[in-house]
């Protein structure tokens, strides 16, 4: 297959959402997306975020459901209009047509979609990097954090720090050139001490290219997907999740949106 659609990816699976990530594997509608959109939920005139025109995105398996994907939302359907949790006030909620209630078949994935840049390409304006996203009440299982932006040319690093006061519960750090290798390093900092690094050689980021990072909080780990493909999971080293109250985003990126929601 030289083109990718979520319907194709799920064909024959016997499950319309086989543990699918919200907005990544199987939660988008097959039809009946935003009126006038070139692709369900896509920005007008663009390929869908995370998809590469003319080819399947990294980690996509045409004809089957990808592995290790995130659970779908508990209830289908779009938000009926109010801003989704973690989205920016003044923007329509994901799945809601501006000025109308949520349309049937529109994105059902809470704010796992693209709330900061409304569904019709309403410009959010780049967010200042470093950027701190408050996580009021901390994180908890089934919370989904979505970050969208573009990697700068000649990038060196991207950093996500899920912070608990002075500590860093989850440090997610793609490095574009560590001794001429690309690697993703994850770690935790407690009581001024950084722990043992966990390293991942799969590297879905490209200098100069847009990206979407989704972090799903589970009971015993963080699960990370990039550009709609599962990347890694990181076991919790800090158990008091409700105290992880801030996400710091920094590095060599321009940041378009950052939001969170329960799924």
């Amino acid at each position: 297959a030289d083109s990718f659609s979520l319907n194709d990816a799920l064909a024959g699976s016997g499950n319309p959402n086989p543990q699918g990530y919200p907005g990544a594997w199987g939660n988008q509608p097959g039809a009946g997306g935003y009126p006038g959109a070139a692709y369900p939920g896509a920005y007008p005139g663009q390929a869908p975020p995370g998809a590469y025109p003319g080819q399947a995105p990294p980690g996509a398996y045409p004809g089957q459901a990808p592995p290790s994907a995130y659970p779908g939302p508990t209830a289908p359907g779009a938000y009926p209009g109010p801003t989704a949790p973690g989205a920016y006030p003044g923007q329509p909620a994901p799945g809601a047509f501006p000025g109308q209630p949520g349309a049937p078949g529109a994105y059902p994935q809470c704010s796992g979609g693209y709330p900061a840049a409304g569904p019709y390409g309403v410009p959010a304006g780049p967010l200042t990097v470093p950027y701190d996203l408050p996580l009021p009440g901390g994180v908890m299982p089934r919370m989904l954090i979505t970050i969208m932006g573009t990697v700068k040319p000649n990038a060196n690093r991207i950093v996500l720090d899920f912070r608990r006061g002075n500590d860093v519960a989850f440090h997610f750090n793609p490095r574009f050139n560590e001794n001429n290798r690309r690697v993703i390093v994850c770690n935790t900092k407690q009581d001024n001490n950084w722990g043992k690094e966990e390293r991942q050689s799969a590297f879905p980021f490209e200098s100069g290219k847009p990206f979407k990072i989704q972090v799903l909080v589970e009971a015993d780990h963080f699960k990370v997907a990039v550009n709609d493909a599962h990347l890694l999971q990181y076991n919790h080293r800090m158990k008091n999740l409700r105290e992880i109250s801030q996400l710091g985003i920094s590095g060599d990126i321009t940041l378009t949106s950052a939001n969170h929601a329960m799924i």
Epitope: P130, R157, V159, D161, G165, N166, V168, H171, N173, R175, N187, K189, D191, N192, N193, W194, G195, K196, E197, G248, S250
Partner: antibody, heavy 120, light 110 residues
């Protein structure tokens, strides 16, 4: 270019005070922990103090507790060390040092140091 | 007195390998705390050579490697070169959130 430049070192009498400054550039200063490390002439390295990016987490070596105070101003990309009740044994080159998650907390960026001499 | 114990000096010939040890306790090196190694040439600031026990920062030669077993960390330099002649310091976090350094090891290239 990532850079740290210390200033403020000088000759001071025992019992006196001194404030060292460190100007940071080339990285997101507020993201990283910062440290002061010193080295007496002909001796080894000695960690003095560290401060996290938000100034909420501050630690000191026992030998300076109550005499030295570390602080930072993220708006000015600056780190400080206020040294009071100085003693002859505090004579050393004082280094401003970054430690970050990028190096597992290792001290990956060092300034050139500023010399503090405590003598009557 | 330094908390971490290093040999005062080691020597080797060009092309040889040498190992510098760094002995601590269960409150620092042996307590699952990261060990780092620094190189310092005379009159210069130290340079990070190894972090998190065994990782090399970008730009550090792969002739430098680190390891840790129990309460002792080690730095190995293979294929010794003249420019490796310097002082080497180990460092560790500690259980009370402080940092400690070793006393330093002078590496002489014969």
């Amino acid at each position: 270019e990532v850079q740290l430049v210390e200033s403020g070192g000088s000759l001071v009498k025992p019992g006196g005070s001194l404030r060292l400054s460190c100007a940071a550039s080339g990285f997101t200063f507020s993201n990283d922990d910062m440290n002061w490390v010193r080295q007496a002439p002909g001796k080894g390295l000695e960690w003095i103090s560290s401060i996290d990016g938000s100034s909420r987490s501050i630690y000191y070596a026992d030998f300076v507790k109550g005499r030295f105070t570390i602080s930072r101003d993220n708006a000015k990309n600056s780190l400080y060390l206020q040294m009071n009740s100085l003693r002859a044994e505090d004579t050393a080159v004082y280094y401003c040092v970054r430690s970050s998650g990028y190096s597992g907390g290792g001290m990956d960026v060092w300034g050139r140091g500023t010399l503090v001499t405590v003598s009557s | 007195q330094s908390v971490l114990t290093q040999p005062a000096s080691v020597s080797g010939s060009p092309g040889q390998s040498i190992t510098i040890s760094c002995a601590g306790t269960s409150s620092d090196v042996g307590g699952s705390y990261n060990v780092a190694w620094y190189q310092q040439h005379p009159g210069k600031a130290p340079k990070l050579m190894i972090y998190s026990d065994s990782y090399r920062p970008s730009g550090v030669s792969n002739r430098f490697s680190g390891s840790k077993s129990g309460n002792t960390a080690s730095l190995t330099i293979s294929g010794l070169q003249a420019e490796d002649e310097a002082d080497y310091y180990c460092s560790s976090y500690t259980s009370n959130s402080a940092r400690v350094f070793g006393g330093g090891t002078k590496l002489e290239i014969k």
